[in-house]
Interface confidence: low
């Protein structure tokens, strides 16, 4: 777009005719206070397109901003509209005038507010008085824009001088609204019902003497209006409260209840909705996912949660192997369902100081008329490792073996490892490790048996050993999911002492 | 805490229409001009459309000028964009701003440093 004069401020002779031309290669308009006025518009023989926009005897009021832009919007960019903005310095003319709205300026928190008064001639002073103060305010001006800065609760005025009168602006009125001056809370008994049942909401609105209560419900949208019931709590002052009955909820019920109050004394006012789900019949539905697997580790205390959504309020059964469970009076198994939330639940089992024998298939049960689930999962007890034996032995061959057993759930897992340095291991030399299948000097064999009733894995290792020609430290290392245990034995040459 | 939310987002063919939702809690909502932005990938954030807090006056980005609609509902706290004609330029996450400033020239709105609260973003795709 081409403008001409370029602007972007122009300085225009009161009475006086000026043109503005604007040319680009699709339709040009130019537009003033969001309206178009009346332009020549054109397009030239090599296909570029102009309007041109005559003022005629200017005024004060002409002052303002003139915008060149597009005449449509098709694949051109936003940046394709160029300001102008035109100053008509006119001695009849004090402030340009404002709408109304422009005149009351209201905030909700201190942020920065322009107040709009502009003059005609650029190179007036202008200067910002509270409405009954004489002294100019620090404030920065614009004189495209007007005032801008944070500004109190206060009634504002402009004031400049015209020859030799002074010419005030019309009053600002800036308002920080106080939100917390009317404060309103909606409740309902319940926010899930069944159809048949009841809906009842309460709005509630505290420190005012006159409000005025208005609700919106999906059933006012179909012409089914319910009348409210509005009282005041007498115990505690300034609590008025009104009251939605909606008997027997149908389907169409559910939706959006909005409680708008109104105080009419400082215009405040404030909403509050809230969502009533009306259901065909009840539900529980599992939230979340339990794994058909879960562990606790012996000797410890493991919770076991099952979080779900019911409606009407279920009972909950724990079971065992079949077997119901209940609270124990030995104070080894702890049964709570805590309701979180109108219809969400969530439910524990807590095994206090696990023994081998709280393993096995748990099953909870969550049960109403309406509706039942039930989630199962196999809880595996845990146990640390532990080596219970490493032992070293001459067996006739020549060969030297260690023999390393250990017990462990989940199964354990064994590293073997060396050390000939006896005075700088383990601290300044790594161990090495000892049983790779390539190692011609030592051989592993490692059998591995679950033990049923203690519901538990035993790993037996022995490690063969070649030729031993100095002392040597070995070491056998168990390690499963919840703890490693080492033990460590030195082999000595058959010539030498045995020592462990 | 004031939150804007916005969502109708979504994937849609050139020359379709999208309606985009901004719900506003935590602030006190007719006294905000609102405003719609966009940010397209390895852009600028950029003005697309604002609704005055008083009148409800409108004020649009040329490129979307005649084919989106900005309008409130000061009930239920929720600005507006009906988005028609859609192109495949219009792709871009589209942000609901809230501002308490007043200016008298609407054209200050195109400033993203004049709004006081910011939604997430909604995905806006317009395939061709």
């Known amino acids: 777009l081409v403008v001409t004069p370029p602007g972007p401020e122009l300085v225009l002779n009161v009475s006086s005719t000026f043109v503005l031309t604007c040319s680009g290669s699709a339709p040009v308009v130019w537009e003033r206070m969001s309206q178009e006025p009346p332009q020549e518009m054109a397009k030239a023989q090599d296909g570029t397109f102009s309007s041109v926009l005559t003022l005629t005897n200017l005024t004060g009021l002409d002052t303002g901003e003139y915008f060149c832009t597009h005449n449509d919007s098709r694949g051109l960019e936003t940046d394709e509209r160029k300001r102008l903005y035109i100053f008509v310095p006119d001695p009849t003319v004090g402030f340009l005038p404002n709408d109304a709205e422009e005149l009351f300026i209201f905030l909700t928190e201190i942020t920065e507010i322009t107040i709009p008064c502009r003059v005609t001639d650029p190179q007036l002073v202008v200067t910002l008085h509270e409405k009954k103060g004489d002294v100019a305010l620090p404030v920065p001006y614009d004189h495209q824009r007007g005032f801008s800065g944070i500004f109190e609760d206060r009634s504002y005025i402009c004031k400049t001088t015209i020859g030799d009168r002074e010419v005030d602006s019309d009053a600002y009125y800036v308002y920080r609204l106080q939100v917390s001056s009317i404060n309103v809370s909606v409740n309902a008994v319940q926010t899930v019902v069944r159809q048949g049942e009841n809906i009842t909401l309460m709005c509630i609105v505290i420190g005012n003497e006159v409000v005025n209560f208005e609700w919106t419900y999906p059933r006012k949208e179909s012409g089914r209006l319910v009348e409210p019931v509005t009282d005041f709590l007498l115990d505690m002052p300034y609590h008025i409260r009104s009251i939605l009955h909606i008997p027997s909820a149908e389907l169409e019920d559910s939706g959006t209840y909005t409680c708008n109050v109104t105080e009419s004394v400082n215009d405040h006012q404030d909403e509050k909705a809230i969502n009533i789900t009306v259901v065909e019949s009840g539900y529980v539905r599992l939230l979340g996912e339990v794994g058909t697997l879960q562990f606790a580790e012996l000797h410890r205390s493991r919770t076991l949660q099952v979080v779900f959504e019911a409606y009407p309020p279920p009972t909950v059964l724990w079971f065992k192997d079949n077997r119901t469970l209940g609270d124990s009076s030995a104070g080894e198994i702890a049964l709570s369902t805590r309701n979180v939330s109108e219809t969400r639940y969530v439910s524990e089992l807590t095994l206090v100081r696990v023994k081998v024998a709280e393993a096995g298939h748990y099953t909870m049960r969550a049960f109403h008329e309406d509706a039942e689930v039930q989630l199962s999962f196999q809880l595996q007890i845990n146990v640390p490792v532990r080596v219970l034996e490493l032992s070293e032995s001459h067996p006739d061959s020549g060969e030297q073996t260690v023999r390393c057993r250990g017990r462990g759930m989940p199964q354990p897992n064994i590293i073997w490892s060396a050390c000939r340095d006896l005075k700088r291991c383990p601290r300044e030399l790594p161990p090495t490790l000892l049983g790779n299948s390539s190692e011609e000097e030592s051989q592993l064999e490692t059998n591995v048996t679950y033990w049923e009733e203690e519901q538990e894995f035993e790993v037996v290792s022995t490690l063969r050993l070649q030729h031993v020609d100095r002392p040597l430290s070995v070491r056998c290392t168990l390690r499963n999911a919840v703890g490693q245990d080492t033990q460590e034995v030195i082999v000595v040459p058959h010539s030498l002492p045995f020592k462990v | 805490e004031v939150q804007l939310v916005e969502s109708g987002g979504g994937l849609v063919q050139a020359g379709g229409s999208l309606r985009l939702s901004c719900a506003a809690s935590?602030?006190?909502?007719?006294?905000?001009?609102m405003g719609w932005f966009r940010q397209a990938p390895g852009k600028e954030r950029e003005f697309v459309a604002i609704?005055?807090?008083?009148?409800?006056?409108?004020y649009y980005a040329d490129s979307v000028k005649g084919r989106f609609t900005i309008s409130r509902d000061n009930a239920k706290n929720t600005v507006y964009l009906q988005m028609d004609s859609l192109k495949p330029e219009d792709t871009a996450v589209y942000y609901c701003?809230?501002?308490?400033?007043?200016?008298?020239?609407?054209?200050?709105?195109?400033?993203?440093?004049?709004?006081?609260?910011w939604g997430q973003g909604t995905q806006v795709t317009v395939s061709s």
């Open positions: 701003a809230a501002a308490s400033s007043y200016y008298s020239d609407s054209y200050y709105y195109t400033r993203s440093d004049k709004y006081n609260y």
């Open positions: 609704i005055r807090k008083t009148g409800g006056s409108t």
């Open positions: 935590g602030l006190f909502f007719s006294f905000y001009n």
